[in-house]
Amino acid sequence: YNNFRKSMDSIGKKQYQVQHGSCSYTFLLPEMDNCRSSSSPYVSNAVQRDAPLEYDDSVQRLQVLENIMENNTQWLMKLENYIQDNMKKEMVEIQQNAVQNQTAVMIEIGTNLLNQTAEQTRKLTDVEAQVLNQTTRLELQLLEHSLSTNKLEKQILDQTSEINKLQDKNSFLEKKVLAMEDKHIIQLQSIKEEKDQLQVLVSKQNSIIEELEKKIVTATVNNSVLQKQQHDLMETVNNLLTMMSTSNSAKDPTVAKEEQISFRDCAEVFKSGHTTNGIYTLTFPNSTEEIKAYCDMEAGGGGWTIIQRREDGSVDFQRTWKEYKVGFGNPSGEYWLGNEFVSQLTNQQRYVLKIHLKDWEGNEAYSLYEHFYLSSEELNYRIHLKGLTGTAGKISSISQPGNDFSTKDGDNDKCICKCSQMLTGGWWFDACGPSNLNGMYYPQRQNTNKFNGIKWYYWKGSGYSLKATTMMIRPADF
């Protein structure tokens, strides 16, 4: 009766045929050949890599699109069923109506069908465009990730080769360290042997020193005897000279007695016409007691009495209170003039103090105090300073106000500790303070990181031990 069938033509379009008697109606519907089903394989020229984070979202969106297409397919099938149902009804009507009416009805049905199909096609085209855009974007992202992964792989390879190189270097160094350790052990053994030999030598030297000390004691006794004899002899000579001058002056009254000249400091020596650097004998104020001092007659106009000098480490400055009181060392080299003399001198008139410093790099600096004096021994030779100028720091490295003098056997500092014992040497320690020019003498390349060296903090810092220092005084009105 009515023959309704669905088939495919050569170009892949769906055909809907309606057979009605001798009349046959064929409807050609367009097929969306661009869309792929979830089962059809997807071929891409992009390198397969780990998908980006948005990849999962894209997959989900594709699945949604597939569902939409599945729904469309179902809708088309429903449409077929609908056409079949309608056709059956319409065929009955066509049989009842005239032939001319059949054609009009069929055209109307066809038109409706084509309109609906065209609408679906348009919707599917939009969906296809969206899918294409999304796919293109995914391909680009995958390509970017591929490139970044390649870059990372190259970096990893470079780092791996670098690590291999380092491991080789490390094993080489390890071998070297082991060799050095072996060498070190051998050296330590030889050092221990040397130490044992030195200990034997030291014990021998100690016994020699004891012998020498005994001889020194004897020599000192002999020296005292000789000095007494010399003194007696000098007295006799002086008496003879007096007698002679007396008899001479009686004969020749024009010959005057030579006056004995004494100098209190190097300024007086300079003013008397002695303008050469050197050791001069000075006399204590209001006393006949004498002391030998070095006079600098050239620096800054001359007339400077040197009260301290460090230059080569030849003299030990870790001395007792008494030694710092009377002085020690050699005035032509390293020495300390003596606290008692300096105290007496600086209490007679106003003195300036100049401290000249040298480092191990060839630099020189100075600190000049326009007023300087030391208190008496009863007040522990406390230092008093005013008016700092100079290049060795804007802040005084001798703590202000002045401190008492401290030695290893005279702890007068402001520290719980014993600064003189800890930092070595006698000085006007605070607690313990920023300077100590009487510290341990350290040679070049051993002069840093020394807490007990020759220190002037506001010039060279705390751990730097200086090469040379000179402390000199001169009357303020010179």
Epitope: D411, D413, K414, C415, I416, C417, K418, Q421, M422, A431, C432, G433, P434, F451, N452, K455, Y457, G461, S462, G463
Partner: antibody, heavy 118, light 110 residues
Framework: QVQLVESGGGLVQPGRSLRLSCAAS????????MHWVRQAPGKGLEWVSG????????AYADSVKGRFSISRDDAKNSLYLQMNSLRAEDTAVYYC???????????WGQGTLITVSS | QSALTQPPSLSATPGQRVTISCSGS????????VNWYQQVPGAAPKLLMY???KRPSGVPDRFFGSKSGTSASLAISGLQSEDEADYYC???????????FGTGTKVTVL
């Protein structure tokens, strides 16, 4: 041999006072500076106070200044720490230590615990 | 707040070498001798090193002290289980006019 023995520790209420003693033996006491060092439970060492061998110089940590007072009695070979206005943060083991010269604590007592709590 | 800074902890296996650093300033480490103390749990501290590098009698020569500028170091070579303890550096401080301890370093022997 050198011995240092602390005493006087215990439980005390905040704001109250306590006096610690340290009995020394085996060395010339007046030759050495003496110190108090404390250690709060589970914490590090903290220097509290020190006194020179000649008793002329004393020093205190900022945390105890004005509240604690150090003293010594050379005739009794004893060191003392008078602690006033005690606070919860003063809770610690208190050690006395000997300093022969170089600010080095070569001998320590066994310590005495002070707990400041209400 | 301590004026001297140390690493809180260090660990090594027996026989290895560890180095504890102690960082200060010119008013303490830079200008005064540094001492090191060892404290085993439940005991009083013990003097381990004085005047930067000197060892009191009885302290093994595995312990080695040194100083450079405002930093001091304590090295323990050939680490042993009995070396497991807290280690403190300490020195005088001019600015504080007092003694200062480091923050302390716990050495663990694995």
């Amino acid at each position: 041999q050198v011995q240092l023995v602390e005493s006087g520790g215990g439980l005390v209420q905040p704001g109250r006072s306590l006096r610690l003693s340290c009995a020394a033996s085996g060395f010339t006491f007046d030759d050495c500076a003496m110190h108090w060092v404390r250690q709060a439970p589970g914490k590090g060492l903290e220097w509290v106070s020190g006194i020179s061998g000649n008793s002329k110089n004393v020093a205190y940590a900022d945390s105890v200044k004005g509240r604690f007072s150090i003293s010594r009695d050379d005739a009794k070979n004893s060191l003392y720490l008078q602690m006033n206005s005690l606070r919860a943060e003063d809770t610690a083991v208190y050690y006395c230590a000997r300093d022969p010269a170089y600010s080095q604590f070569d001998y320590w007592g066994q310590g005495t615990l002070i707990t400041v709590s209400s | 707040q301590s004026a001297l800074t140390q690493p809180p902890s260090l660990s090594a296996t027996p026989g290895q070498r560890v180095t504890i650093s102690c960082s200060g300033s010119s008013s303490n480490v830079g200008g005064y001798p540094v001492n090191w103390y060892q404290q085993v749990p439940g005991a009083a501290p013990k003097l381990l090193m004085y005047t930067d590098y000197k060892r009191p009698s009885g302290v093994p020569d595995r312990f080695f002290g040194s100083k450079s500028g405002t930093s001091a170091s304590l090295a323990i070579s050939g680490l042993q289980s009995e070396d497991e303890a807290d280690y403190y550096c300490a020195t005088w401080d001019d600015n504080l006019n007092g003694y200062v301890f480091g923050t302390g370093t716990k050495v663990t022997v694995l």
